[in-house]
């Protein structure tokens, strides 16, 4: 690092708000797409290149000039598994977090021309190639269609689709956001014979309605109506089907075979929460009760003679939590062995840590193959000899991530593949394996600048550096950058981790203002080893503010004792722990305890508001962006997972005493900035409207900003710049900064 320890003598520029908003310093990614066990695609100067993983040589797969005459701006592309066709996506129109509609064309790579016959319709909701060959499944107007050949007519699979009512092969709002984290509800079998799909019925689901103001010329605002089940409201129902795409006929309608939920689910409200193909003719389904502490995995086999799917109780696997909910957010997915007779799955062990358990499909009990006071984050690949996983075991740091492999013939033989590669720079890895796991790309995202490398599984040898961000490194040498401290405090004999973004030339003998950046939702993690260039970088670098985050009770990846501490009690311990963290930071000697602020977005906005409304006297001011204010306003799947039902027999009392509004009086002691997008489909504007009303009713002066037609991300270019500029002014004013 250039410069000196003396801040006054350091002539380098700081990282400014403009640098953040204009993205002056860009992190370079290396986004590859594996197309086989030894080749991947990479986009360079808009050419699509195909790389050989072993040798690193490349050739042009598709030149950027290919579609010069296309007439549309291509948003994305997808190559068929057999490499014969490329699907081009354009006219992209965003819907919710994952969902969008688009237009598609298919380009024949052999004939080097666009297919003009039997085109996929405009406003298609989802398209996916089969895993092998070049079949296509797509959803249009809430119905599913299959193309056996790109140039031939489609077969219609479903006929029941109806906007906002029946969804075939796509998710409704709550399943998209809270269950599958995807718009797709289609699952091809490994060889593309079968297409499994879910059907969601929102007939009885209440609608959220909000105004969309649109262009200034629109005299009457549009009303957006979305089926959205709030806590305790009527939920969507789900059905599951499988269709054989090898027996489709243009003469008769496709026959979809239903697989019903287990009876333990049918007796009440329930969700479909995972679909995984085990073999060509075996599928596993996970179902979850509305009270999300009980899930069932069904393993269903195809009966060729009848064309039906049989799910025997002897092969059911139940997962239950006595201390909270099942899974981190939902039950984890199984990873099946090649024969489909056994699988590996991350579940909570006796001590409440999430580890890998080995199941045989006909046995109820499983064998844990990992153990310890750390957690497995994800199973990344499974071969005949090894299972590869990411965990936070290394050096006992919950905020780190490393890649491990475990020998399946001897579970004691575990190797960390990433720990010692670059231990100072790289402590937080993710991975992308080739089709059969012969090669893998390691993506290191901190604490140093991101580093992308390619490796061979044969000997775990590093093959080459793909991107090291050296250009950015050179640029940042000329910037006074903050440093990041990751450490823990001990409260009630338990370690709780925090991170601090410290100003350049940090001097522990000086006093700094502190901003607590909070999320604090169940299974969240804000203290980690990731390198980021964000608003906090500006605040620390230019404004000399310490930006801290703290993972208290309810946070994830440290065992269920910590995570399930807030079960049925949102708005309690996770809120108290942020206040306690600020007190602890105050005692460290370098924090100006008259200038402590807090801010958060979404769940973080809720916690910020609850903290500011606690009357603790610790915080001078705070900002809540798109906060939850009362759990009865938020969606059923997320809320009920942690809070149960808002009924007198269940947990209504705590729903009612965990609102921001009930703390309105205490806001007289703090400076508060409340921000929300008017078109927030997720945390509805209603939530902030009710905070505002409650504050007005008790005479609290506060600041507020709405963002017209912005959703939960407030992410349009102008709104993004405006919100961060506005928040910067507020924080600077609060801290009496020039």
């Amino acid at each position: 690092n250039k410069g000196t320890d003396d801040a006054t003598a350091d002539s380098r520029k700081t990282y400014t708000l403009t640098d953040y908003l204009k993205n002056t310093y860009r992190l370079k990614l290396y986004s590859l797409r594996w197309i086989s066990d030894h080749e991947y695609l990479y986009k360079q100067e808009n050419n699509i290149l195909v790389f050989n993983a072993e040798y690193g040589n490349s050739s042009v797969f598709l030149e950027n000039s290919t579609f010069d005459e296309f007439g549309h701006s291509i948003n994305d592309y997808s190559i068929s598994p057999d490499g014969q066709f490329i699907l081009l996506e354009y006219n992209y129109v965003k819907q919710w977090r994952h969902s969008y509609t688009a237009s598609y064309d298919i380009y024949d790579l052999n004939k080097r021309q666009l297919i003009t016959e039997e085109r996929i319709p405009n406003n298609t909701q989802w398209v996916t190639w089969s895993p092998v060959g070049h079949k296509l499944a797509y959803v249009w107007n809430n119905d599913i269609y299959v193309k056996i050949e790109p140039n031939l007519p489609s077969y219609r699979i479903t006929w029941t689709g109806k906007e906002d009512i029946i969804y075939n092969g796509i998710t409704d709002w709550v399943y998209e956001e809270e269950v599958f984290s995807a718009y797709s509800a289609l699952w091809w079998s490994p060889n593309g014979t079968f297409l499994a799909y879910a059907q969601f019925n929102d007939t009885e689901v209440p609608l959220i309605e909000y105004s969309f103001y649109s262009d200034e010329s629109l005299q009457y605002p549009k009303t957006v109506r979305v089926p959205y089940p709030k806590a305790g409201a009527v939920n969507p129902t789900v059905k599951f089907f499988v269709v054989n795409t090898d027996s489709l006929s243009s003469v008769t309608n496709a026959t979809s075979i239903q697989i019903t939920a287990p009876a333990s689910m049918l007796i009440g409200d329930h969700y479909l929460c995972d679909v995984t193909w085990a073999t060509q003719e075996r599928i596993s389904l996970q179902w979850l009760r509305r009270i999300q502490n009980y899930s069932v995995m069904d393993i269903c086999d195809y009966d060729e003679s009848s064309g039906r799917w049989n799910c025997l109780v002897a092969r059911q696997h139940i997962e239950m939590s006595t201390t909270g909910w099942v899974g981190r957010f939902r039950p984890s997915e199984p990873h099946f062995t090649l024969d489909g007779n056994s699988f590996y799955k991350i579940i909570s062990n006796e001590e409440g840590y999430r580890h890998i358990c080995y199941f045989q499909i006909d046995k109820k009990d499983c064998t844990f193959i990992t153990k310890g006071t750390w957690e497995v984050i994800g199973i990344e690949a499974l071969t005949s000899d090894y299972l590869y996983y990411i965990s936070n075991e290394y050096k006992g740091m919950p905020g780190g991530r490393n890649l491990y492999k475990i020998q399946l013939s001897d579970y004691t033989k575990v190797t960390c593949l990433s720990c010692e590669l670059n231990p100072e720079r790289c402590q937080y890895y993710s991975v992308s394996f080739s089709k059969e796991a012969k090669y893998y790309q390691l993506r290191c995202s901190g604490p140093g600048l991101p580093l992308y490398t390619l490796h061979s599984s044969v000997n775990d040898k590093g093959l080459r550096v793909l991107e090291d961000n050296s250009a950015l490194d050179k640029m940042l040498q000329n910037v006074q950058m903050p440093s990041k401290k990751l450490d823990f405090i001990i409260l009630n004999e338990t370690k709780f981790w925090y991170q601090m973004i410290l100003p350049p030339h940090f001097d522990k003998s000086k006093k700094y203002p502190l901003l607590l950046d909070v999320y604090a939702g169940p299974c969240s993690q804000k203290a980690d080893t990731v390198f980021r260039l964000n608003w906090a970088t500006y605040l620390a670098s230019t404004e000399n503010i310490i930006v801290a985050s703290f993972d208290g009770r309810g946070s994830g990846y440290q065992g269920d004792k910590i995570m399930h501490a807030i079960n049925r009690r949102l708005g309690t311990f996770e809120v108290e722990d942020q206040i306690e963290a600020a007190r602890q930071f105050s005692k460290m000697g370098f924090v100006d305890n008259k200038r402590i602020a807090i801010w958060g977005w979404s769940y973080g906005g809720y916690v910020t508001s609850m903290v500011l409304g606690s009357g603790s006297g610790v915080f001078k001011c705070g900002i809540a962006v798109a906060p939850v204010s009362r759990w009865e306003y938020y969606d059923s799947v997320y809320t009920e997972r942690y809070m149960g039902l808002p009924t007198p027999e269940d947990n209504l009392d705590h729903y009612r005493n965990s609102t921001v509004m009930s703390r309105a009086e205490n806001f007289k002691q703090v400076e508060y900035l409340l921000i929300h997008g008017t078109a927030d489909d997720n945390v509805h504007f209603q939530q902030s409207a009710q905070i505002s009303k409650a504050l007005v009713d008790v005479g609290v002066d506060f600041q507020a900003m709405w963002y017209t037609d912005e959703d939960h991300g407030i992410a349009s270019s102008t709104a993004h710049q405006h919100i961060y500029t506005h928040m910067s002014h507020f924080i600077k004013q609060c801290f009496s900064l020039p």
Partner: antibody
């Protein structure tokens, strides 16, 4: 070998109570669900109640809701049907059974126990 | 609740006959239908699960078919031991419901 054995049936007056037992062997009831099905003399089969011992979930036919309670003791591998406020129309042979597949088909049944409600 | 209606209520047949029993549901049956055989004084025995799956140990002369609301049990060649009462049952929608039964008697 999988077996289900019911006991506890008998003659009882209207308004009275009776507790039926269903002892399972050859499998753990924790891993299955147990269901009571009854058959009035000369009549068809009627589902009465179900329990999933591992989760503690229960479900009842409308005709017995509020009067009958299904329970299980996993340590004894036994399910029970507590029948209160008995009526003449509850007279039947009571069978316990377990599910075979997710479609609700029952592969193993007990031999049945007769409950007669009469004054 | 889904009503299951069996027809006929009873039938007379001879050994070797092909016998068909139908079961009609009041609405689409989600999962499928099971068929049971019951002899006097005995518990029901599972014959067919999931509409068409032949349960272990059940002779292959028994078969099941159907979808939606209409389901069929077929005995391809009636044997002396097959004279009994047969019940259909759906369990894919809660609550479980049974047909009223079909009695197969010797002609």
């Amino acid at each position: 070998e999988v077996q289900l054995v019911e006991s506890g049936g008998g003659l009882v007056q209207p308004g009275g109570s009776l507790r039926l037992s269903c002892a399972a062997s050859g499998f753990a009831i924790n891993n299955y669900s147990i269901h009571w099905v009854r058959q009035a003399p000369g009549k068809g089969l009627e589902w009465v109640a179900s329990i999933w011992p591992y989760g503690g979930f229960t479900s009842y036919a409308d005709s017995v809701k509020g009067r009958f309670t299904i329970s299980a003791d996993t340590s004894k591998n036994t399910a029970y049907l507590q029948m209160n406020s008995l009526r003449a129309e509850d007279t039947a042979v009571y069978y316990c059974a377990r599910f075979f597949s997710s479609y609700g088909d029952m592969d193993y049944w007990g031999q049945g126990t007769l409950v007669t409600v009469s004054s | 609740d889904i009503q299951m209606t069996q027809s006929p209520s009873s039938l007379s047949a001879s050994v070797g006959d092909r016998v068909t029993i139908t079961c009609r549901a009041s609405q689409d049956v989600s999962g499928g239908v099971a068929w049971y055989q019951q002899k006097p004084g005995k518990a029901p025995k599972l014959l067919i699960y999931g509409t068409s799956g032949l349960y272990s140990g059940v002779p292959s002369r028994f078969s099941g078919s159907g979808s939606g609301t209409d389901f069929t049990l077929t005995i391809s060649s009636l044997q002396p031991e097959d004279f009994a009462t047969y019940y259909c049952q759906q369990g894919g929608d809660w609550p479980i419901t049974f047909g009223q039964g079909t009695k197969v008697e010797i002609k």
